[in-house]
Interface confidence: low
């Protein structure tokens, strides 16, 4: 048998892993598509993405709303050319997050 | 021109985002493959699993050590025989991680 | 508070190689996106920038001086040293040290080398 | 490598009065990335280069707003509305957009 603590514990876990904004390291180069004789560095940076479980397989994660933030990051063009430039890149941060359908349902259907 | 105290936010950041051993949600069933008869909920769970960042593109971030840790689940069958049951499922957790090549280098390569 | 400080000799002799310690605080080499170059200015000329290295070891060198220079770093010591061939007497200059950002912001107060038998 | 040519050599100014030093580069100093990295520095006797004004126009902290810096492309200016005693040295405009980086020849400036 099982009791209310185990049932709290099991239930904590379920709520920590449940479809939420979670910090996460993105590839700004990747992010910006930006040319390949352009990189940045640090090359990667922390914002939240939506990330986590949802109750059915037919529901997906996704972003409901989006915040851009502004990171400061170092543009180096291959072969270098100058000093390393600090530009601002601003990189899409996840405040809002919903399970839903994976693609547009029929209405009918 | 950029001062020492923005280099030091920018050192920080690129710290965080480095690989390492990062919490994650990883789905149960999809883990530990099993049959589409049995289902366990909470279907998700949190463990620390390799992710961030590395310096080079060739690098990956894979795991250099892993631990066992056991979570208490509830295992259903469909159709339902019987009372869902309280069992331990052991979920890998990684507790090193390294920026290794993607594939085996060549030895003269 | 940034401060760097150039040490080496004063008088070397042509054909000898001269060996110059940049010795900084205020900051890291170890930092991201730090860089510790040189540059020089013989008597009453213009400056010449001549070598950088960054955080991250890598180096670059003015194509011009590339053959005769190398640049290291100690970060644990806070120093980097500028190593340069060949001296003749046309190398007679003060080398500053500078922490390179964009533009030149800090630098060391010079130290006057002179190239002479 | 980018020739930054300064004008004139020697510039004696009387206190009180404006004065201009003209610096021309070889190439055009927009980088790739839009910025325009050409700087001015003063050296006064005996000391090192001190940052006056950084891209193009941007005067550095604590520089006094006498000094302001003018131009695009190739041709660039630095201007002091009033000259005082303490603005003598040697001013050098310099560029940071092309490796190897490159300083002009200097423009000294002293009181007539």
């Known amino acids: 048998f099982y009791d209310i603590e185990t049932l709290k514990v099991i239930d904590e876990e379920w709520q920590r892993t449940q479809c939420s904004p979670r910090e996460t390291c993105v590839e700004v180069a990747s992010e910006l598509g930006k040319s390949t004789n352009t990189f940045f560095k640090p090359p990667c940076v922390n914002v939240f993405r939506c990330g986590g479980c949802c109750n059915e397989e037919s529901l997906i994660c996704m972003n409901t709303s989006t915040s851009y933030i502004s990171k400061q990051l170092f543009e180096i063009s291959v072969p270098l050319t100058s000093v390393p430039e600090l530009v601002p890149v601003k990189v899409a941060n996840h405040t809002g997050c919903k399970c839903l359908p994976t693609a547009p349902r029929h209405p009918y259907s | 021109f950029y001062d020492i105290e923005t280099l030091k936010v920018i050192d920080e950041e690129w710290q965080r985002t480095q690989c390492s051993p990062r919490e994650t949600c990883v789905e149960v069933a999809s883990e530990l493959g099993k049959s589409t008869n049995t289902f366990f909920k909470p279907p998700c769970v949190n463990v620390f699993r390799c992710g961030g960042c590395c310096n080079e593109e060739s690098l990956i971030c894979m795991n250099t050590s892993t631990s066992y840790i056991s979570k208490q689940l509830f295992e259903i069958s469909v159709p339902l025989t019987s009372v869902p049951e309280l069992v331990p499922v052991k979920v890998a957790n990684h507790t090193g991680c390294k920026c290794l090549p993607t594939a085996p280098r060549h030895p003269y390569s | 508070q940034v401060t760097l400080k150039e040490s080496g000799p004063a008088l070397v002799k042509p054909t000898q190689t001269l060996t110059l310690t940049c010795t900084f605080s205020?900051?890291?080499?170890?930092?991201?996106?730090?860089?510790v170059g040189w540059i020089r200015q013989p008597p009453g000329k213009a400056l010449e920038w001549l070598a950088n290295?960054?955080?991250?070891?890598?180096?670059y060198y003015n194509p011009v001086l590339r053959s005769r220079l190398t640049i290291s770093k100690d970060t644990s010591k806070n120093q980097v040293v500028l190593t340069m061939t060949n001296m003749d007497p046309v190398d007679t200059a003060t080398y500053y040290c500078?922490?390179?950002?964009?533009?030149?912001?800090?630098w060391g107060e010079g130290t006057l080398v002179t190239v002479s038998s | 490598d980018i020739v930054m040519t300064q004008t004139p050599l020697s510039l004696p100014v009387t206190p009180g009065e404006p004065a201009s030093i003209s610096c021309r580069s070889s190439?055009?100093?927009?980088?790739?990335?839009?910025?325009?990295?050409l700087h001015w520095y003063l050296q006064k006797p005996g000391q090192s280069p001190q940052l006056l004004i950084y891209k193009v126009s941007n005067r550095f902290s604590g520089v006094p707003d006498r000094f302001s810096g003018s131009g695009s492309g190739t041709d660039f200016t630095l201007k002091i509305s009033r000259v005082e005693a303490e603005d003598v040295g040697v001013y050098f405009c310099?560029?940071?957009?092309?490796?190897?980086?490159?300083f002009g020849g200097g423009t000294k400036v002293e009181i007539k």
């Open positions: 310099s560029q940071s957009t092309h490796v190897p980086w490159t």
């Open positions: 190439q055009s100093l927009v980088h790739i990335n839009g910025n325009t990295y």
């Open positions: 290295i960054w955080w991250n070891d890598d180096k």
């Open positions: 500078v922490q390179v950002t964009n533009p030149f912001v800090f």
């Open positions: 205020g900051f890291s080499l170890s930092t991201y996106g730090m860089g």
